[in-house]
């Protein structure tokens, strides 16, 4: 004969455990029902009566099967630099993520504690590694034959245009200026993903290094996550 199905509350077998979605109540010394997500234990079980569950109040939640006496409070409203990607319901906490152009500088268990504006690379430097949800932009000096004349969190170093006759040689922060009205613009290898076509390096220019107060680039690409920074567009 099949074993009889036990209904909660029941005493477990010696050395046995309670079933899924049940818990062992130390006071009653019985296996009792857990409450489903969105509810909490209003009255704990006894030897003769099972757990009494009740719905979570507004702005509180439980995400798992539980026997907590009170639901958890939802996190505070998202700050101005964040967007709410998951609303507070009886079954889930509010989740705030950083708005576009920002990244999470200080994280918490769920969502982000503090967002920071993506830093920009200044002229003479291009984006080496784009910003992500959790890391800042990394900049790199434009190599000889390339330039960036913008302050941007997205622009990479672009090759100088090739001139038939150079009027002004390009440098790290400025494109070459041609005397000819139609400079050559050929696609750089592997650059098809870029929004605008870029030429191969110019052999006619002698680029000067980008102006930088930093004597080296040891701060540029640290091992591990890039050093981020905080900022908020101002008042």
């Amino acid at each position: 004969l099949p074993a009889q199905v036990a209904f909660t509350p029941y005493a477990p077998e010696p050395g046995g455990t309670c079933r899924l979605r049940e818990y062992y109540d130390q006071t009653a010394q019985m296996c009792c029902s857990k409450c489903p997500p969105g509810q909490h234990a209003k009255v704990f079980c006894t030897k003769t009566s099972d757990t009494v569950c009740d719905s979570c109040e507004d702005s509180t939640y439980t995400q798992l099967w539980n026997w907590v006496p009170e639901c958890l409070s939802c996190g505070s409203r998202c700050s101005s630099d964040q967007v709410e990607t998951q609303a507070c319901t009886r079954e889930q906490n509010r989740i705030c993520t950083c708005r576009p152009g920002w990244y999470c500088a200080l994280s918490k268990q769920e969502g982000c504690r503090l967002c920071a504006q993506l830093r920009k690379c200044r002229p003479g430097f291009g984006v080496a590694r784009p910003g992500t949800e959790t890391s800042d932009v990394v900049c790199k000096p434009c190599a000889p034959g390339t330039f960036s004349n913008t302050t941007s969190s997205t622009d990479i170093c672009r090759p100088h245009q090739i001139c038939h006759v150079v009027a002004i040689p390009g440098n790290a922060s400025m494109d070459a200026v041609c005397t000819s009205t139609s400079p050559t613009r050929s696609m750089a290898p592997g650059a098809v993903h870029l929004p605008q076509p870029v030429s191969t390096r110019s052999q006619h220019t002698q680029p000067t290094p980008a102006p930088s107060t930093a004597p080296g680039t040891s701060f540029l690409l640290p091992v591990g996550p890039s050093p981020p920074a905080e900022g908020s567009t101002g008042d």
Partner: antibody, heavy 121, light 110 residues
Amino acid sequence: QSVEESGGRLVTPGTPLTLTCTVSGIDLSSYTMGWVRQAPGKGLEYIGFISSSGHTYYANWAKGRFTISKTSSTTVDLKMTSLTTEDTATYFCARDGGYGGYDYTGIFNLWGQGTLVTVSS
Amino acid sequence: DIVMTQTASPVSAAVGGTVTIKCQATESISSWLAWYQQKPGQPPKLLIYGASTLESGVPSRFSGSGSGTEFTLTISGVQCDDAATYYCQQGYIYTNVDNTFGGGTEVVVK
């Protein structure tokens, strides 16, 4: 390249005051400029800065009461309102080093000599 | 809020000796840390940025180390001219902070 602060003087509590930072040999469209203060015998206290692209950043305590703005190609102002005796300090203007090719790093490598603001009744 | 805490003042050193100043951040700041030297009546002078990169023109007896939350400034072969107050500064967060600087550590050279 140099940085010089001006406008510091003795004022009574509640009086607004504007300090000016004048730069020489520095392109304000390429560099971020910040303000730091130091009360007599105390440590350095970050106020905020204005990036080369014009964004402003402030310490919590400075928000709403202090305003940083570029007023010309060579000057950056620090406007202060509702001054109290606690604001008595030497105010320094400094240039951000732009390390790692960044627009701003909050790390300052060229400082002015400072201008003294005394708030007293 | 990230708070920077430095070694208590004063720190004494003999000429030719070694001085170590510690700086602790309440949150990880990666390598976004700078060290400054300030003498009375003068503005601060940047010594080290990126936790360990020596600013141009700064003597090599100054060195910095650390990452995350623990940082150290070391002065090897201390000279009389090194008597000053030293400040650490985090460059990780600029808003939602009360101060980016540590409280300062005075170095006295005997």
